[in-house]
Amino acid sequence: GALEVQVPEDPVVALVGTDATLCCSFSPEPGFSLAQLNLIWQLTDTKQLVHSFAEGQDQGSAYANRTALFPDLLAQGNASLRLQRVRVADEGSFTCFVSIRDFGSAAVSLQVAAPYSKPSMTLEPNKDLRPGDTVTITCSSYQGYPEAEVFWQDGQGVPLTGNVTTSQMANEQGLFDVHSILRVVLGANGTYSCLVRNPVLQQDAHSSVTITPQRSPTGAVEVQVPEDPVVALVGTDATLRCSFSPEPGFSLAQLNLIWQLTDTKQLVHSFTEGRDQGSAYANRTALFPDLLAQGNASLRLQRVRVADEGSFTCFVSIRDFGSAAVSLQVAAPYSKPSMTLEPNKDLRPGDTVTITCSSYRGYPEAEVFWQDGQGVPLTGNVTTSQMANEQGLFDVHSVLRVVLGANGTYSCLVRNPVLQQDAHGSVTITGQPMTFPPEA
């Protein structure tokens, strides 16, 4: 028969900094050998070469050395491409072209996404506030993609739409920083919430500020960090926010700033003697030197790893001193599950089959749910195992044993409990003798 090249109909959603698999499969004829195979991945629009396999050999990446095939799976018809450290610029359509004797191609879309950080809220003016004063509340959320939707509401959940100005600016990596400004007249007290939504990830990041007029300042060095854990995706950069209140006339020469791991007290990064003393943590940390004088002691942690998860203490000493701890919660999304069936040929009603649902490289451990075509949960005869690789990421394999009816759909949902991200796969088995896999 003809060479059939298959790719997913839906776009592959990949998080910036993570690896993505662009799935592509073909149907090899009996007796097929890799010496016969020509495989080309290219950008659909510009036809720029991305990766190729020819003359029985992987010819390598022509795309910034960030692509790889799965050489051990090629002979079985798996022509998928692994794209490492995804960037915003990678978004678009990739064509998988396979030529043996016959040839065929199909295009798969890559949709890039990056979650927005928990918004930081600033108030202007922020001192001696009284009912009736007009204040400007700025909600800032960073390093997301694509552009965000921003919503404001009051303490009762009523939307605030008037006097809102939102701007979004892309940085050199193409990630957006969003700044939304709300101007309000203060009541006796009030809570103002800002919600930043990533339309692709359907991820909401929110923060609120409660303004109680007539707060008295303490005069002490006040070190402030976010109450909620900072959620960072493996491979991306994270900002551990920390701010302090500099006194008038404060100079950086007076500042001692130390970031350390809360539990072990291991030094992470420091600033003293008027100078950034650099990273003591695998050279993956940086301060924001231009912002220190304004009281911004935040720490940038690059290429986040699972092992980074935990509590970091920000210690500020000028004349007075203070500290606060911020938690880093590491996460990695699970891949779209792949489904396998055993046995996978000549299936008939009454046969017992084993359906395996596999999802890869997520963190933390996943929750796995099975259900039938009517959405009824399947809990009996399910065995789930999760194994961490050397980077601490989990591969999850869940096995369901079922007796086939006349026909049936079996769905597997792999949930990341931190990202509240669901990845699902399903298989439909029809009653007449059939061969797996059908297209899900």
């Epitope: 003393q277 000493s317 004349r319």
Partner: antibody
Amino acid sequence: GASVVESGGGLVQPGGSLKLSCAASGFTFSTFGMSWVRQTPDKRLELVATINSDGVNTYYPDSLKGRFTISRDNAKNTLYLQMSSLKSEDTAIYYCASAEGRRGAYWGQGTLVTVS
Amino acid sequence: DILLTQSPASLSVSVGETVTITCRASENVYSNLAWYHQKQGKSPQLLVYTATNLADGVPSRFSGSGSGTQYSLKISSLQSEDFGSYYCQHFWGIPPWTFGGGTKLEIK
């Protein structure tokens, strides 16, 4: 001039509790971090607790965490150290000292705590 | 915690001589180091802060130097009131800010 005066020391049995006080005068106490430092019979100095100017942040060596509590009352210009589950190795002269960022300037004359 | 090692532990010298006491830190303390003098039966008195700065009222025969992990206190032309014990203390990082073991200076 500036001075700090410790009080509350004395003889206590093992397992007992004691609360030390330190009265400050002659400087703006409410803007200074403060520490309790002890000097053991072998003359070694050990910082046992530190508190920042508004009392929000407190620090202890891991070995003493849970047994000692430092606190302050800025309205009264007074620093406190609550000690519980005392052991013989807590026998020392306890000094109250300022901890202004990178310098320790004002020290008291000390109060003797004997656990026996 | 950072360990401060003082040397020598004791020394015996005559009035008018010059002595140097050293303090080695187990890691860089970035000049956040103080020196104290303690006379028998008295509380410690601050001599030097941030490694090189003399505290108010301290005679100029005392001088502090050093950086990184190595620091020293030099006393030129020793006077009788200079005898007693000397301690270093760092103020780097999150407390506890530890002390050196002390140096006992005796009259020969």
